[in-house]
Amino acid sequence: MNGRVDYLVTEEEINLTRGPSGLGFNIVGGTDQQYVSNDSGIYVSRIKENGAAALDGRLQEGDKILSVNGQDLKNLLHQDAVDLFRNAGYAVSLRVQHRLQVQNGPIGHRGEGDPSG
């Protein structure tokens, strides 16, 4: 019997300071290139090593970015979303949605890592 996969969705405000090479991540998504079916949202596709986002540590690949400096990212073309990030200020505030996968085993199931009583 397989366990059920649930998702724990949390939101976080992440304030990044632009480093010498910028914010340091890539995005996918937008109304013209949906990354998730029936969702035109903007998602983090890559965190660049030693970039501002990586050094901060909170932004993760797969996170959905809801807004930049208070500006909603809904219903934007991909390139318009990219422009919004590139042309934002030195201090950038991101509203981010983290989606954490939670594995729920059936009742009475003891996972391999569980200590035996």
């Epitope: 914010l23 991909h78 390139q79």
Partner: nanobody
Framework: HVQLVESGGGLVQAGGSLRLSCQAS????????MAWFRQAPGKEREFVAA????????YYADSVKGRFTISRDNAKNTVYLQMNNLKPEDTAVYYC??????????????WGQGTQVTVS
């Protein structure tokens, strides 16, 4: 590799005008988005204006709207910044930035060395 070379900076009186140019050279440049940023002494680098094609978009910082105009000549791989009615607070080093058109990075890929603009 792409090189960006700015020119056109200088000393101008308040109310005067300057036209900055930035030429992109290098085999890999593909007429992607280009922008101007500036950095005043003791301050952080700030966005001034940007231009993109496909679909065409032009953006300005609120502080320069109505005074500065960004344009580009794709045949020459050059972007211009026409600056009118200059104010002392426009004094800064002006930097050109460019990105490859297919880049999904939220950062500009290339930066110039900057050109000084001083408004007295």
């Amino acid at each position: 590799h792409v090189q960006l070379v700015e020119s056109g900076g200088g000393l101008v009186q308040a109310g005067g005008s300057l036209r900055l140019s930035c030429q992109a050279s290098g085999r890999t440049f593909d007429s992607g988005p280009m922008a101007w940023f500036r950095q005043a002494p003791g301050k952080e680098r700030e966005f001034v204006a940007a231009i993109r094609r496909s679909p065409e978009r032009i953006y300005y910082a609120d502080s320069v709207k109505g005074r500065f105009t960004i344009s580009r000549d794709n045949a020459k791989n050059t972007v211009y910044l026409q600056m009118n009615n200059l104010k002392p607070e426009d004094t800064a080093v002006y930097y050109c930035a460019a990105a490859l058109s297919r880049s999904t990075s939220v950062d500009y890929d290339y930066w110039g060395q900057g050109t000084q603009v001083t408004v007295s």
